[in-house]
């Protein structure tokens, strides 16, 4: 009689991350006696995935009854398949024996493949804010996916970025992967409305990407602009004194008015007027009644804004001659403010 | 070489449930079968539940099946195994083992590290 073969037609099998995975295994006697194991790797180090004789199995199966006389098949299905489940099965026949059953033979081994689908990419940004024309890092994090081929794209407001540095780790076989890439990005004055997006493909996908997105209003700070302008109002002795606080971002911003160095009145920017590209402009105005005073008067709008150091505009009031219009404002831009009279 | 180190032991009812962990270092977790067993005083040290490297298999001596629950976290190098319904004769030291080698119920044969031991004592 010919002499037992085990028999594993398939030389690979590839299985998506959750789903089962059938091992085929037949042997082409019932002789000798004894049982069948299947175990994952070969030599001393192997692991022993299934003994027909003893165990507990969770995940595994048999295909059919193994405790029939004359069952010659020996297949096995893993469920609930991860990553770490990849590697050579092999399954063996053991030859009955005292005290210990003997390795008799075994099959040529079939190779699982594991296919796992990234995580959904995580995008950061810098810590703390930077202003236009400044180059700040994003980094983007997928993890989780096998095989370890990949492909990263970054993009900002729909065009292709070329400067960032992706590595997939670790760089020899491993059950699952990891990607990192770091773009560089240069911010605009026009960015409080631009994303940041980072684009993963990979074969689980089936060509519908994974993206990851940053939004630049997180990132950016954009310094407002002072204008300081007066203009008469009422009787005669009263001027009013506007400052214009235009193109800031974000929102945080604190102003105050300063009469010959001496602080007059802080206030918050709270109804502010926003632009198309995100950002913000306030106007606050001081009432002054130049009939009090007998020289000239510096006023100084000082503003500082989202915790940066203040930045100013001063005004030269004359009080000897005829206060004239010396500037104008839109009616856009005039939110409004308090009212104060310097006596 | 491998160090285990043992907790989770102590003294508790009968019925109650304990569980007993050992964390595993020097070598790679993930390529180490584990096994714990036990030794009453008096008695020679006993089989008590192995699993292989991924988990995906595990063994049980038969006084224990059902009772005992034998787990791995091969992220933090950890082994447990969950005891519940202890009863008097549960009274021993528990031992944790690492084999590089796994053959089912051959684990004690094949167990090349063993831990120190932690003591569960199941008062009636």
């Known amino acids: 009689e010919e002499e037992l073969q085990v028999i594993q037609p398939d030389k690979s099998v590839l299985v998506a991350a959750g789903e089962t995975a059938t091992l085929r295994c037949t042997a082409t006697s019932l002789i000798p006696v004894g049982p069948i194991q299947w175990f994952r790797g070969a030599g001393p180090g192997r692991e022993l995935i299934y003994n027909q004789k003893e165990g507990h199995f969770p995940r595994v199966t048999t295909v059919s009854d193994l405790t029939k006389r004359n069952n010659m098949d020996f297949s096995i299905r893993i469920g609930n398949i991860t990553p770490a489940d990849a590697g050579t099965y092999y399954c063996v026949k053991f030859r009955k024996g005292s005290p210990d059953d003997v390795e008799f033979k075994s099959g040529a081994g079939t190779e699982l493949s594991v296919r796992a689908k990234p995580s959904a990419p995580v995008v950061s940004g810098p810590a703390a804010r930077a202003t236009p024309q400044h180059t700040v890092s994003f980094t983007c994090e997928s993890h989780g996916f096998s095989p370890r081929d990949i492909t990263l794209k970054w993009f900002k407001n729909g065009n292709e970025l070329s400067d960032f540095q992706t590595n997939v780790d670790p760089v020899g076989e491993s059950v699952s992967y990891s990607i990192h890439s770091t773009a560089k990005v240069v911010l605009t004055r026009e960015d409080v409305h631009s994303q940041v997006i980072c684009e993963v493909a990979h074969v689980t996908l089936q060509g519908d990407p994974l993206r990851g997105t940053a939004n630049l209003s997180e990132t950016i700070r954009v310094p407002p602009t002072l204008e300081v302008t007066q203009q008469p109002v009422r009787a005669e002795n009263q001027v009013n004194v506007t400052c214009q606080v235009r193109k800031f971002y974000p929102q945080r911003l604190q102003l105050t008015w300063l009469e010959n160095g001496n602080v007059s009145r802080t206030e918050t920017a709270s109804t502010v007027t926003e632009n198309k590209d995100g950002t913000y402009n306030w106007m606050s105005w001081l009432l002054v009644n130049v009939s009090a005073h007998r020289d000239d008067v510096k006023l100084t709008c000082q503003v500082e804004h989202d915790g940066q150091p203040a930045v100013s505009k001063s005004h030269d009031l004359k009080v000897s001659a005829h206060p004239k219009e010396q500037g104008s404002n839109t009616a856009a831009e005039n939110t409004g403010s308090n009212e104060r009279n310097i006596y | 070489q491998v160090q285990l180190q043992e907790s989770g032991g102590g003294v508790v009812q009968a019925g109650d449930p304990l569980r007993l962990s050992c964390v595993a270092s020097g070598r790679t977790f993930s390529s180490l079968d584990m096994g714990w067993f036990r030794q009453a005083p008096g008695k020679e040290r006993e089989f008590v539940a192995g699993i292989s490297r991924s988990g995906i298999s595990q063994y049980y001596a038969d006084s224990m099946k059902g009772r005992f629950t034998i787990s791995r976290d091969n992220a933090k190098n950890l082994v447990y195994l969950q005891m519940n319904s202890l009863k008097p004769e549960d009274t021993a030291v528990y031992y944790c083992?690492?084999?590089?080698?796994?053959?089912?119920?051959?684990?004690?044969?094949?167990?090349?590290?063993w831990g120190q031991g932690t003591q569960v004592t199941v008062s009636s």
């Open positions: 083992a690492a084999a590089l080698t796994f053959r089912g119920s051959d684990l004690p044969r094949d167990s090349n590290y």
